[in-house]
């Protein structure tokens, strides 16, 4: 899913405010619902009709610097007799999420707001036929 | 998939620097490649075997303000005869998100992430069964 | 241990509606899925429909659609059961009941039941 | 849907016999869970994917069967064990269960 552009209003103060100075504004340390789990520890991803592959980005100038990747191992599914289907096509699900992105010339570190697009699993679909008229 | 804690390193300065003031940073306007898009296939939540609906959740203090769910429609999987097959599960799929939460006092505007948890779209799986030795 | 505790009996109308709740504990509500069942006297068990807290995906019984919807509270961790435009052949014990978690065991492998719910229509 | 039929529909046992239930698909499944009811009260299961004894279910009880012809046995039944039986799968849609067969003690 995608995520809309920021235009110029969500980071900036009201218009009766005086305006941000240089560019940048005040990023509170510490993440909220840090503690919140994905109860997703279940291998969905060999078990799936259409079964994907983890690979995992890393970028220590990244948080998280850790970004995992999902590509599909088919270009069928996976029918009950383990054989692949190539009537049904596997397909990535994708997902553009934030990231931050750490900057720094010495002792001056500062932070910017980054969308990554990532494929966080596939999904078996029935093919677009597109019938001659 | 799961983002890591941040621990207390990410947001913080070299240790041979002084320490951030107040416990917020600078975080810069703008965000790196925003006009990067999400190439799915069209209509994928109606052609898979494991179909889902969206529904839009929005916020005015959040970045992005909308964040879109998936849900499942069914419990079991869509055969090739439209049928729903319940020897096969439906399951979510599901990806930690950073947003962007906006606090502000009169004037006084800062930011802090936060932790979402996003259903992103859903995938047919064989439940594992446990035979008996 | 798992507890599914039903609503008490109702006697209706025909032609009005019924919510039968299931208050679960015990286990994590949003992990598994939730089924309803009913039972006319001395009948054999029709499984109606069941739910996924977590994903929010349904499943119906063609014979129930239209008839029963399937909803879930999950912060207070209670499924509901409503039925609608009530008639004498809705008259039944219905039963929720615990299914999979859709990895470990299928979504429809039902294993513990609530105490039962007996709605009676009559004019 | 699949047909689930159970023999036979009813039974009157003495303690200490052996008793077998048939639960017959009009469809091939590859699982089947057995069930007890006991007079006003609700079901209770006792065995899954057709030979899986559930947990606290005595080992007197025990499944098998595969393709349409299922089996649920009662070794040397005990008075607690009147009740009725019920056969059910998952395999098709709708989930569906056998008519019952209740056992009565003699």
């Known amino acids: 899913r995608k995520i809309p552009k920021v235009g110029h209003t969500f980071f900036q103060k009201p218009e009766s405010c005086p305006p941000v100075p240089g560019g940048s504004m005040k990023l509170d340390i510490g993440i909220i619902n840090e503690n919140q789990r994905v109860s997703m520890s279940r291998n969905i991803e060999s078990r799936s009709t259409s079964p994907w592959n983890y690979t995992v980005t890393w970028d220590p100038n990244r948080y998280p610097s850790e970004v995992v990747q999902a590509q599909c191992r088919n270009l069928g599914c996976i029918n009950a007799q383990g054989k692949e289907d190539i009537s049904m096509n596997s397909v990535p699900i994708q997902q553009e999420t934030l990231v931050v992105r750490r900057k720094h010339q010495g002792c001056s570190v500062s932070f910017q707001l980054e969308k990554v697009l990532v494929t966080v699993g596939c999904t078996c679909v029935t093919p677009v036929i597109h019938h001659v008229q | 998939r799961k983002i890591p804690k941040v621990g207390h390193t990410f947001f913080q300065k070299p240790e041979s620097c002084p320490p951030v003031p107040g416990g917020s940073m600078k975080l810069d306007i703008g965000i790196i490649n925003e006009n990067q898009r999400v190439s799915m296939s069209r209509n994928i939540e109606s052609r898979s075997t494991s179909p889902w609906n969206y529904t839009v959740t929005w916020d005015p203090n959040r970045y992005p303000s909308e964040v879109v769910q998936a849900q499942c429609r069914n419990l079991g999987c869509i055969n090739a005869q439209g049928k729903e097959d319940i020897s096969m599960n439906s399951v979510p799929i599901q990806q930690e998100t950073l947003v962007v939460r906006r606090k502000h006092q009169g004037c006084s505007v800062s930011f802090q992430l936060e932790k979402v948890l996003v259903t992103v779209g859903c995938t047919c799986v064989t439940p594992v069964i446990h035979h008996v030795q | 241990q798992v507890q599914l505790v039903q609503s008490g009996a109702e006697v209706k109308k025909p032609g009005a509606s019924v919510k039968v709740s299931c208050k679960a504990s015990g286990y994590t509500f949003n992990e598994y899925t939730m089924h309803w069942v009913k039972q006319s006297h001395g009948q054999r068990l029709e499984w109606m429909g069941g739910i996924n807290p977590n994903s929010g995906g349904v499943s119906y019984n063609q014979n129930f659609k239209g008839k029963a919807t399937l909803t879930v509270d999950t912060s207070a961790s209670t499924a509901y059961m409503e039925l609608s435009s009530l008639r004498s052949e809705d008259t039944a014990v219905y039963y929720c009941?615990?299914?999979?978690?859709?990895?470990?065991?299928?979504?429809?492998?039902?294993?513990?039941w609530g105490q039962g719910t007996t709605v009676t229509v009559s004019s | 849907e699949i047909v689930l039929t159970q023999s036979p529909d009813f039974q009157s046992v003495t303690p200490k016999e052996k008793v077998t239930i048939t639960c017959s698909a009009s469809s091939s499944v590859n699982y089947m869970h057995w069930y007890q009811q006991k007079p006003d009260q609700s079901p209770k299961l006792l065995i899954k994917?057709?030979?899986k004894l559930a947990s606290g279910v005595p080992s007197r009880f025990s499944g098998s069967g595969s393709g349409t012809d299922f089996t649920l046995t009662i070794n040397s039944l005990e008075a607690e064990d009147a009740a009725t039986y019920y056969c059910q799968q998952w395999n098709s849609h709708p989930l569906t269960f056998g008519q019952g067969t209740k056992l009565e003690i003699k």
């Open positions: 009941a615990r299914g999979g978690d859709g990895y470990y065991t299928n979504y429809f492998d039902i294993d513990y």
């Open positions: 994917d057709t030979s």
